[in-house]
Interface confidence: low
Amino acid sequence: MAENGDNEKMAALEAKICHQIEYYFGDFNLPRDKFLKEQIKLDEGWVPLEIMIKFNRLNRLTTDFNVIVEALSKSKAELMEISEDKTKIRRSPSKPLPEVTDEYKNDVKNRSVYIKGFPTDATLDDIKEWLEDKGQVLNIQMRRTLHKAFKGSIFVVFDSIESAKKFVETPGQKYKETDLLILFKDDYFAKKNEERKQNKVEAKLRAKQEQEAKQKLEEDAEMKSLEEKIGCLLKFSGDLDDQTCREDLHILFSNHGEIKWIDFVRGAKEGIILFKEKAKEALGKAKDANNGNLQLRNKEVTWEVLEGEVEKEALKKIIEDQQESLNKWKSKGRRFKGKGKGNKAAQPGSGKGKVQFQGKKTKFASDDEHDEHDENGATGPVKRAREETDKEEPASKQQKTENGAGDQ
């Protein structure tokens, strides 16, 4: 009998493992999962199990490769493939992701449901368990405050409009004796907007004033630090290749000095780099590393550390460019903390143009995504695109960040 009980436990564990991995690689999560998308590019879609077991929710289930492989080999979904040497898995190339058309987005929206009334200490597992017999669920998004506290409400995506409709239309649903408010996501937004109309202008104005004050402080600090950057400007000029771009400069100086700003447009024959430290040092290091001959795309380049009036003028221009860039972002109504209109090289840890794991690091960009994170799905370096902690927007706007928008 005990053996039978063990078998049942194992089967339950295997089902959970399959469900978790198939969620990670599923239609809902994968397009939003920056880290996994990066991994998939690296080795024909194969992701080492070594990396998979660092994902929090899988890690809690098992870290045993054999158990994972065994579980996936029994999966009915046939979404995943296991490599010959059983050390890697991938989403089967025969099951490509659906194209994200307007029609597809609309379909997802129509099977998304809002549920409110859970205790704020409920865990994702509690909610999953409660939803178990409520229809096929593809994604659960626990809504959170800015400080990551669960609000007691969730968004759920069902596999079909029919199952979502059936769920919404089931009367008297409770979670542990508590009545739940259940609405289609769209209806929830409509209701919320209606409630907000009264105090919207006032709240908006207050938020805007606070935001502007905060932003001004940030800008002032930034301007001040820029004005202190005497000796940090490096001019480059020459018969540059038309394809020369800022990325080339970033690569050239990647180990020699941190670039704060690059004033250069593709096709131009000259530009200016603003370093965090002294430009002379960065130039010296880069020259040493390149046997004294510092070229861009095999073209000779004249490098000159700016001084005096020329430097002041260049600094003034950079300050103006940054200001203009900030204003552009402000006019888009977006919270902005960057340093420029794409003229800035990728910063360490920004994830831009970089593989997001480095050797010994065991915390992955996906850890938060696959655990319980804020309602807007923004994790790591991606900043929150909204000012208020409880402000909702339609799904189409919400999912602008590339990071995951779900828990599971």
Partner: antibody, heavy 119, light 105 residues
């Protein structure tokens, strides 16, 4: 367009090392794997190893682990393969190839470098 | 590791003739890839994902198969098709077949 250009033919004495280059153009070097493949006269193709210039990661076919060392110079968009302690068995054409970004194949190849090991 | 065996090793065909060469895997694989290599040149991607033709490959070529058995077919041989064809699979690492040399009669 995408191009992979390998260095010229090499005649090397046994025991010496050799370094072959594969200069790429027409695409973002750091976004694609470069693989090296060995082909002996009248024989098939044998995978040696790869480098991913994006993070410097490398992997080798066990058979070539102590023979080949792969490096990349990102500013010049060039991949290199150094072969050590050469013997006549190493005489072959060495090809570099770019692996498709999400494909399971090699989409572009270098023209090959002929290595002759002889005293 | 998987071993890919191509047969025949050498074959010849007259222009207009139908040609089929096979690639047998020692254990099941998901996809097969084919390359064409002419004497003194590097290989060219020819067929990918078992049956898709790479750009510039004439429509007379086709690929098929599954599991352990795959094939490349030329519906009507032309002189320019004379070359060595290699199959290749990719599980954790690339593995090439032994090659089939196709000559024109």
């Amino acid at each position: 367009q995408v191009k992979l250009e390998e260095s010229g033919p090499e005649l090397v004495k046994p025991g010496a090392p050799v370094k072959i280059s594969c200069k790429t153009s027409g695409y973002t070097f750091t976004n694609y794997y470069i693989y090296w493949v060995k082909q002996r006269p009248g024989q098939g193709l044998e995978w040696i190893g790869y480098i991913y210039p994006g993070n410097g990661g490398t992997a080798y076919n066990q058979k070539f682990k102590d023979k080949a060392t792969l490096t990349a110079d990102n500013p010049s968009n060039t991949a290199y393969m150094q072969l050590s302690s050469l013997t006549s068995e190493d005489s072959a054409v060495y090809l570099c190839a770019r692996r498709g970004a999400l494909g399971y194949y090699f989409d572009y190849w270098g023209q090959g470098t002929t290595l002759t090991v002889s005293s | 590791q998987i071993v890919l065996t191509q047969s025949p090793a050498i074959m010849s065909a007259s222009p207009g003739e139908k040609v089929t060469m096979t690639c047998s895997a020692s254990s099941s694989v998901s996809y097969m890839y084919w390359y064409q290599q002419k004497s003194g040149t590097s290989p060219k991607r020819w067929i990918y994902d078992t049956s898709k033709l790479a750009s510039g490959v004439p429509a007379r070529f086709s690929g098929s198969g599954s599991g352990t058995s795959y094939s490349l077919t030329i519906s009507s041989m032309e002189a320019e098709d004379a070359a060595t064809y290699y199959c290749q699979q990719w599980s954790s690492n690339p593995q090439f077949g032994t090659g089939t040399k196709l000559e024109v009669k």
